[in-house]
């Protein structure tokens, strides 16, 4: 006959009892049976007793009574009674269960996670249960996602089941976070917390944290550490494959680091003790998470004994350039284990010699290379524990770009001027490694006589290489070169001698070697003006005369020549421009600006200045001339003429010196006839002297001088007596 299932004394699917009370539950069946209880109810508990007895008609049935004293809220759950030794396929007829709520107003939730949230792993698209089951079926529970969201049961996607908690049928990323079940009982709020973690198969990174390739001496221990980084909600499987895997040579340890708030780090450490040659080869760490897979490998080399080989990377003699930010001197080294590295410079430890020397692996790095870094460099390699030593030397040449010393020491802001026709010596002293060659070039100045621009010397003109026989530009006397030790360095001095300075231009000395070229320009400006700037006043004029001033400047050194008048008004000096550059006359070497003021009056007295701008410095230069216009004054004689006697055939001089403003004009008369200059009668400067050569009798008479200017005239007369007889009378 069909076996009838066991029966429980409490009917229905669920039952509520109060916490602290005793739970009685009887099971009656047709076969031997056992109880299945909630995990929280321990079968060893003193609170629990199960008594078995024969029961029913003729004592043919099996009965079992479960008694749970002082039932607690956490005893809530399924209590079931099932037959022993009955096939599971007939489970329905062999088991009876009831869900018992142990109601406790002070504990609405069976499991309370208020201190630390319970972690629940979820998979998107799958069912997710927030297991906040309650101790009484009529407790209202709210599901919240911290901080602000509330998940409302809709009977479809979100379902409330007092025996299970909240069932989310199709979980999404929205359910990731801190989920809280809240219940208010007797005005008191209770919370139980859950942290949902999305289970993913993401592998962020896999690394073997050992240098590649791994090198070991035979008999040593190999340790390889494989690290897999994943999101917090990923779990991985890590496996190794290696050369002697079949003999299970390696031991593997695993651990997980979950201290990082954003990632999990899984470690798998492979160890092989006393490695042999058979352990050399490829080691692969494979990481799998669901369908995701990543792997990383490394090569392991096993060496029988320590060794060093060292070779030059290129050649034995190396070259670099002074001024280089960094130079790496390196050797080709193969060694195991890693040797100690010491670099020597000229036999002394390099890094002790200068802080600019740094050892990096098998290289010596020289920072900010100088020519002092030239020398012999030796790498000393040693594996002391194995008594293996090697060394190798390389020579470093430091090339230096040429430098011209006159360029460095020259403090002239503007070019020197060379007097017209002078002999000049130009020198350039250069230094460099290799020793530079020096050549001289000439670039003539551009003569621009248009009024729009001043004459200038630019780099646009064609340049000519000079030799002693060159006939370009100025005549060259010689070009010589000599070696000189200056400041302890062997320098090359080249001298160009200009025999006759006639043409303005630019001489350049150019020093070159394989590193580079440097040049020095010597502006060679010829001047026919002392110091390149000269002001001239023809004469100090008197009222009514013309004032004539001229200003001459070197045309390559100055521009914008102007005459100005300086006037003092209210203790301030005012500049009045009175003549401009456009009136200037440009000549081969200079510019002259003439100033003429006709018919001057006393008011024209003052300080006249010639202003010009230095082409190189932009500075304005003034050269001043004080002009004082003299008042008109009637002539007066400094000494009157006096009678005198002169021997025939001799010569005589009559002086008539007169002052006055303007300067008086002197007129001579003899016996009231005006004297003209003729052979034998000479009028001296300004007609102030009358000179008679080889006096004759006819020269005797009254001589009279008259000094005249606009203000009047003055006269003086004297008698000249001629003594003795003439040749003619002697002949007679």
């Amino acid at each position: 006959s069909k076996l009838k299932g066991p029966e429980l004394s409490l009917k229905g699917t669920q039952h509520v009892t109060q916490a602290g009370q005793t739970l009685h539950l009887q099971c009656r069946g047709e076969a031997a049976h056992q109880w299945s209880l909630p995990e929280t109810v321990s079968k060893e508990s003193k609170r629990l007793s199960i008594t078995k007895s024969a029961c029913g008609r003729n004592g043919k049935q099996f009965c079992s009574t479960l008694t749970l004293n002082a039932a607690q809220a956490n005893h809530t759950g399924f209590y079931s009674c099932k037959y022993l030794a009955v096939p599971t396929s007939k489970k329905k007829e062999t088991e009876s269960a009831i869900y018992i709520f142990i109601s406790d107003t002070g504990r609405p939730f069976v499991e309370m996670y208020s201190e630390i949230p319970e972690i629940i792993h979820m998979t998107e698209g799958r069912e997710l249960i927030i297991p906040c089951r309650v101790t009484s079926p009529n407790i209202t529970v709210t599901l919240k996602k911290f901080p602000l969201d509330t998940l409302i049961p809709d009977g479809k996607r979100v379902i409330w089941d007092s025996r299970k908690g909240f069932i989310i049928s199709n979980a999404t990323y929205k359910e990731i976070g801190l989920l809280t079940c809240e219940a208010t009982v007797n005005g008191h709020l209770y919370k139980t917390n859950y942290l949902t973690h999305r289970q993913t198969n993401t592998i962020i990174d896999v690394q073997i944290s050992t240098p590649r390739p791994v090198k070991l001496l035979r008999g040593h221990t190999l340790i390889l550490n494989c690290t897999a980084t994943t999101p917090l909600n990923t779990r991985v499987q890590m496996t190794w494959s290696y050369p002697d895997e079949k003999n299970k040579r390696a031991s593997v340890r695993r651990r997980i680091d979950q201290s990082n708030s954003h990632a999990n780090i899984f470690y798998s450490v492979l160890t092989i003790d006393k490695v042999q040659n058979k352990d050399k080869g490829l080691y692969t760490c494979r990481v799998r998470s669901g369908p995701s897979f990543k792997s990383v490998n490394t090569s392991v080399h096993i060496y029988d004994k320590a060794f060093i080989t060292v070779k030059h990377r290129k050649q034995q003699v190396l070259e670099t350039v002074a001024g280089k930010r960094s130079y790496r001197l390196s050797m080709k080294v193969k060694a195991f284990p890693s040797p100690e590295v010491v670099w020597l410079k000229d036999g002394l430890p390099a890094t002790e010699k200068s802080a600019r020397y740094l050892t990096r692996g098998y290289s010596l790095i020289i920072k900010d290379v100088t020519e002092e870094d030239a020398g012999n460099y030796t790498i000393l390699l040693s594996i002391k524990q194995s008594n293996v030593f090697k060394n190798l030397t390389a020579t470093l040449i430091v090339n230096v770009k040429p430098q011209i010393y006159e360029k460095a020491v020259s403090s002239f802001p503007d070019p020197a001027l060379y007097p017209l026709g002078s002999r000049q010596i130009l020198t350039c002293t250069a230094y460099g490694i290799p020793r530079p060659t020096i050549k001289w070039c000439w670039r003539p100045c551009n003569h621009n006589h248009s009024e729009a621009r001043y004459d200038f010397c630019s780099n646009n003109e064609e340049s000519f290489i000079l030799d002693p026989d060159s006939n370009i530009g100025n005549r060259i006397e010689s070009i010589t070169q000599r070696m000189a030790i200056i400041e302890g360095k062997n320098k090359t001095a080249s001298t160009l001698v200009v025999a006759d300075s006639r043409i303005s231009g630019i001489y350049s000395c150019i020093a070159s070697n394989k590193v580079g070229t440097v040049g020095r320009n010597i502006s060679f400006y010829i001047t026919d003006v002392p110091n390149g700037f000269h002001v001239n006043l023809e004469k100090m004029p008197t009222e009514g005369e013309d004032l004539k001033l001229s200003c001459t400047v070197n045309k390559f050194l100055y521009r914008d020549v102007t005459w100005i008048l300086l006037r003092t008004v209210n203790n301030r000096t005012m500049h009045y421009s009175i003549s401009k550059q456009k009136m200037a006359i440009t000549k081969e070497h200079s510019i002259t600006l003439n100033l003429t003021i006709m018919n001057v009056s006393l008011e024209d007295s003052g300080t006249y200045a010639c202003r010009a701008r230095n082409v190189y410095t932009g500075e304005e230069i003034l050269q001043k001339k004080e002009v004082t216009i003299r008042d008109q004054e009637a002539p007066y004689l400094l000494r009157n003429l006096s009678d005198h006697t002169v021997a025939i055939s001799s010569s005589t001089t009559l002086d008539c010196h007169a002052n006055g403003a303007p300067e008086p004009q002197i007129t001579w008369f003899k016996n009231n006839h005006k004297i003209q200059q003729e052979p034998g009668i000479i009028l001296g400067p300004g007609s102030s002297t009358l000179f008679i050569e080889r006096v004759t009798e006819e020269d005797e008479g009254v001589y009279h001088c008259k000094a005249t200017n606009q203000k009047g005239s003055v006269e003086s007369s004297a008698y000249l007596t001629v003594q003795g007889t003439s040749d003619k009378s002697n002949l007679e």
Epitope: L148, D149, Y173, I176, G177, L178, L189, S261
Partner: antibody
Framework: EVQLLESGGGLVQPGGSLRLSCEAS????????MNWVRQAPGKGLEWVAT????????SHAPAVKGRFTISRDNSKNTAYVQMNSLRAEDSAVYYC????????????WGRGTTVTVSS | QSVLTQPPSASGTPGQRVTISCSGS????????VYWYQQLPGTAPKLLIY???QRPSGVPDRFSGSKSGTSASLAISGLQSEDEADYYC???????????FGGGTKLTVLG
């Protein structure tokens, strides 16, 4: 690297408005709630507002309710606070913070942006 | 006036243990997790303790947190000069529906 960067602070007159922005990088911005917290000179921290991960639910401190509005644009990984009818007592350094990782506290903070309300 | 109450200052010498208290009510501390923040001078706050007693990675184990009823406390053992900072407790408040903070405690490391 997980980072928040605030901007939009400055000097504004009483009654004026400002909009602060908070740009997030280095984490899944759309999964986490965002907050604005302020700190007046020499004073303590004061919560201003919170917005849920989707931007559908907000909560504001009583002192700013009706004047300030928190919002977010998940496509731009940016949270905002629109501040209207500003008062002198709103002058502070405004920090934005997020509840990322596993802590569900304010575990990522920006450097802050200064708001000065003065005539 | 802060919703959570903290002592305004605390001090200790290097190596000492210092405790900072934080008291609230049933609507905040009692029913929610407590968080502690450290704010070094001129910087933004940094999370020090979460879920009452948990330490984020990188926070030394000298810092520990606890909660009981409506109060919480932060303990710093083996005090170091770099611990000199302002410390704030914070939690969610159910009635306010928002975060609440303590007024902050200025910790001074003496000597």
């Amino acid at each position: 690297e997980v980072q928040l960067l605030e901007s939009g602070g400055g000097l504004v007159q009483p009654g004026g408005s400002l909009r602060l922005s908070c740009e997030a990088s280095g984490f899944d911005f759309s999964t986490y709630a965002m907050n604005w917290v302020r700190q007046a000179p020499g004073k303590g921290l004061e919560w201003v507002a919170t917005i849920n991960s989707e931007g559908t639910i907000t909560s504001h401190a009583p002192a700013v309710k009706g004047r300030f509005t928190i919002s977010r644009d998940n496509s731009k990984n940016t949270a905002y606070v629109q501040m209207n009818s500003l008062r002198a007592e709103d002058s502070a350094v405004y920090y934005c913070s997020s509840t990322t990782g596993t802590t569900h506290g304010m575990d990522v903070w920006g450097r802050g942006t200064t708001v000065t309300v003065s005539s | 006036q802060s919703v959570l109450t903290q002592p305004p200052s605390a001090s200790g010498t290097p190596g000492q243990r210092v405790t900072i208290s934080c008291s609230g009510s049933s609507s905040n501390i009692q029913n929610n997790y407590v968080y502690w923040y450290q704010q070094l001078p001129g910087t933004a706050p940094k999370l020090l303790i979460y879920f009452n007693s948990q330490r984020p990675s990188g926070v030394p184990d000298r810092f520990s947190g606890s909660k009981s009823g409506t109060s919480a406390s932060l303990a710093i053992s083996g005090l170091q000069s770099e611990d000199e900072a302002d410390y704030y407790c914070g939690t969610w408040d159910d009635s306010l529906n928002g975060w609440v903070f303590g007024g902050g405690t200025k910790l001074t490391v003496l000597g």
